[in-house]
């Protein structure tokens, strides 16, 4: 056929996989009669008749291409649709008339890949090895044509190296005629690889220009021997008693090896192993001054038996230890004098404080308090406290409590309680002195004592209202070996208009309990009630 | 220095009376309870009864109400047992001792040794 | 009124040995954080010597070796290292109440 030795290159179609190829034939008015065109698909140089036009009228053949084949443009341009990878071939139209002329056109078939998987060498690496290990391969699956990989570590790309990197790929036609493509990357690794990061990158064009997508980063288990061992206490800084602390052995080889934790034994000098939990912590809690010591670690290479030793570290657990005032129980005569001194040992220096137990006022800044002219009103607890000003919340504290000889002083002299005829009243009355007072009672009734504090003590007394009792009052008396004292509780019938808003009728009117500094208590109504005082 | 001396001791025959003393030296007497507690030959101690010199209140251990009587002389610093109707089982070392208002003693004398037999 | 019962009521040791001595109170001897209970030493022939008061608190001039600790009904005296000059009957005694009462006393012998 004459012209057929210099053949112009076909026209190139680029197209996505699944979507629709435009194949316009390209033949001339000169060259053919575009109402009268035979389409053809040449795959190892040998052409099939896919479809023929005739008037303008297209028909497809019968075969692969029969569904997917239809003419646009007016008979110009013959559309292939889904599009896949077996359709990349040479396909060509040729006119009838005047004479026979053909026009080809090459269709370019592409196909994205997946996202590249990259799965890591889960055995991970020993940087002694020979030759180049596995270290982790890449999949980038359904791509058309191959993609191209390359590797990376720490963001530089890598190169074929002897005996150092070597990158083996493979791919596989899957049934569809998409490419999956598997590369392997090998290398000698060595211990600052521990760290590396990796990953592949896949380069593939598009009708649109060339892409690429890249995996995730991966590390690289790498396996090295261990150099040196070491520990660490957490938290850093002062340790105080009462505080969670952690002793942990660590080492700079991987896989580490098998710790244990010793304490020095202060008496013998020898290294006596400690009880850690199951990640091989020393966990100290609550921390004890005894805790304090020379520790160190000791790892051992299971596979080498190589033992190596820690450098050993002090701990120090720092505390303060039981306060200690003296006298312990103090005892003195109105008018007298009084020291109270605080001892305490600690790891560090102490601060000493004196406060008042009741009011927390601070007396003094020191461990000695001295107390002149002792008043009954000087009684109570007074409490030091011998803290670490370095370490804040390291404190002991000690109370002590004062006890002034004196008869009983009563929490009020005499006091209003209004009651109804016939009703259970539940009369207190509370009474403080060194010794402790005992409180008796002028009326029958039931009465319970309760010790309030080495000094001071309450009476409470179940009495019923009659007209006698209402005549006479109650008295309560105080006494110890030093005196007594009384208290009167007059005894009022209410009626409607002494009643005050918030009273109850009912509960209101059974309970009146008689206690120093409260002179209104919530379930009784009382009037004009005096200060507490004492009968002394 | 704080001390507290028993006295008048001895052998007495069943029935009769005898009357301690215990001075008291380096202390406020007054300011002080003092007590007597006993111990017969291998046994154990047993309290007997208390004073309070500043106002003479006395305390005694149900077992000798009416049988004994604590006393003091503060003019002297002295305290007394004055005991009546001794029995055999009374036979005991007698000690005074010195306490404050939580009632634990604090300063003892030495004894003095009371044998009840005829 | 209120029984003390001390145990052991005799016991052998060795010179600094640990020592531990109870009291049991038939009821409690503690009152709003003091517990009312003493321990006294008595040697052949000499007075009983106030060791400890108030539970816990060390008498003036009594080595620090002896200790005590306790609350409500039961108490210990500990020895925490003896000494030859210890070997001694001990007695604990309350003060809660009227009448005042020891415990029998522990003979502490050497073993």
């Known amino acids: 056929v004459p012209g057929e030795a210099e053949q112009p290159a076909p026209e190139l179609v680029e197209v996505e996989v699944g979507s629709t190829a435009l194949l316009k034939c390209g033949l001339s008015q000169s060259q053919g009669n575009l109402s009268h065109v035979d389409w053809f698909s040449v795959h190892k140089e040998k052409r099939t008749l896919i479809f023929r036009v005739r008037q303008g009228q297209g028909q497809s053949e019968p075969g692969e291409y029969e569904q997917r084949l239809s003419l646009q443009d007016r008979g110009a341009t013959l559309a292939l649709t889904q599009v896949t990878p077996q359709d990349e071939r040479i396909f060509l139209c040729q006119g009838k008339r005047p004479r026979s002329q053909e026009y080809r056109i090459q269709l370019r078939v592409y196909k994205a890949p997946e996202e590249p998987n990259i799965q890591v060498n889960p055995l991970g690496i020993p940087v002694n090895s020979k030759e180049p290990e596995e270290v982790a391969t890449c999949v980038g699956r359904n791509g058309y044509p191959i993609p191209q990989v390359i590797w990376y570590k720490n963001g530089r790309p890598l190169k074929e190296e002897k005996n150092r990197v070597h990158i083996q790929s493979s791919q596989t036609v899957e049934s569809s005629g998409l490419y999956t493509l598997q590369s392997i990357l090998k290398a000698q690794l060595v211990k600052e690889d521990k760290d590396a990061q990796f990953y592949c990158e896949l380069n593939y064009r598009l009708p649109s220009g060339n892409h690429m997508k890249e995996s995730r980063e991966v590390t690289v288990p790498v396996f090295y021997p261990t150099e040196k061992v070491w520990l660490e206490v957490e938290p850093v800084g002062m340790l105080k008693e009462g505080d969670r602390v952690e002793i942990r052995c660590l080492a700079d080889g991987n896989p580490p090896p098998h710790f244990s934790i010793s304490k020095q034994n202060p008496s013998t000098r020898e290294a006596e192993e400690e009880t850690t939990n199951d990640n091989g912590v020393l966990v100290l809690e609550p921390a004890r001054k005894e805790h304090s010591g020379r520790y160190e670690c000791q790892g051992l290479d299971l596979d080498t038996m190589i033992s190596l030793l820690s450098e050993p570290q002090e701990l120090l657990v720092n505390y303060v230890s039981d306060v200690r005032v003296s006298p312990a129980a103090p005892e003195r005569q109105e008018g007298s004098s009084l020291t109270l001194t605080c001892e305490a040992e600690s790891s560090q220096d102490l601060e000493f404080q004196w406060l008042r137990e009741e009011t927390g006022q601070v007396l003094e800044r020191g461990p000695v308090l001295q107390l002149h002219d002792l008043k009954r009103e000087a009684g109570g607890g007074y409490r030091c406290v011998a803290s670490v000003p370095s370490i804040p919340g390291l404190n002991r504290t000690q109370l002590v409590n004062v006890a002034i000889f004196g008869p009983p002083w009563m929490a009020f002299k005499e006091r209003k309680v209004w009651v109804k005829e016939n009703m259970v009243l539940n009369l207190s009355c509370e009474a403080s002195g060194h010794p402790r007072p005992t409180i008796s009672w002028n009326v029958n009734g039931t009465a319970s004592e309760q010790d309030q504090d080495p000094q001071r003590v309450l009476s409470t007394l179940n009495v019923l209202v009659t007209p006698e009792l209402l005549e006479t009052g109650v008295e309560c008396t105080a006494s110890n070996d030093l005196g007594k004292n009384t208290s009167i509780l007059f005894l009022e019938l209410v009626n409607l208009t002494t009643l005050t808003p918030d009273s109850n009728t009912t509960t209101g009117l059974s309970t009146s309990t008689a206690s120093p500094h409260t002179r209104a208590n919530s379930t009784s109504t009382e009037r004009k009630l005096p200060e507490p005082e004492s009968r002394g | 220095q704080v001390q507290l001396v028993e006295s008048g001791g001895g052998v007495v025959q069943p029935g009769r009376s005898l009357r301690l003393s215990c001075a008291a030296s380096g202390f406020t007497f007054s300011n002080y309870w003092i007590h007597w507690v006993r111990q017969a030959p291998g046994k154990g101690l047993e309290w007997v009864a208390r004073?309070?010199?500043?106002?003479?209140?006395?305390y005694y251990n149900e077992k000798f109400k009416g049988r004994f009587t604590i006393s003091r002389d503060n003019s002297k610093n002295t305290l007394y047992l004055q005991m009546n109707s001794l029995r055999a089982e009374d036979t005991a070392v007698y000690y005074c001792?010195?306490?404050?208002?939580?009632?634990?003693?604090?300063?003892w004398g030495a004894g003095t040794m009371v044998t009840v037999s005829s | 009124e209120l029984v003390m019962t001390q145990s052991p009521s005799s016991l052998s040791a060795s010179v600094g040995d640990r020592v531990t001595i109870t009291c049991r109170a038939s009821k409690s001897v503690s009152i709003s954080g003091y517990s009312y209970m003493h321990w006294y030493q008595q040697k052949p022939g000499k007075a009983p010597k106030l060791l400890i008061y108030?539970?816990?608190n060390l008498e003036s001039g009594v080595p620090a070796r002896f200790s005590g600790s306790g609350s409500g009904t039961d108490f210990t005296l500990t020895i925490s290292s003896l000494q030859p000059e210890d070997f001694a009957t001990y007695y604990c005694?309350?003060?809660?109440?009227?009448?005042?009462?020891f415990g029998q006393g522990t003979k502490l012998e050497i073993k």
């Open positions: 005694q309350h003060s809660r109440e009227l009448p005042y009462t």
């Open positions: 004073i309070y010199p500043g106002t003479d209140i006395t």
């Open positions: 108030l539970a816990s």
């Open positions: 001792a010195r306490s404050g208002g939580y009632w634990y003693f604090d300063v």
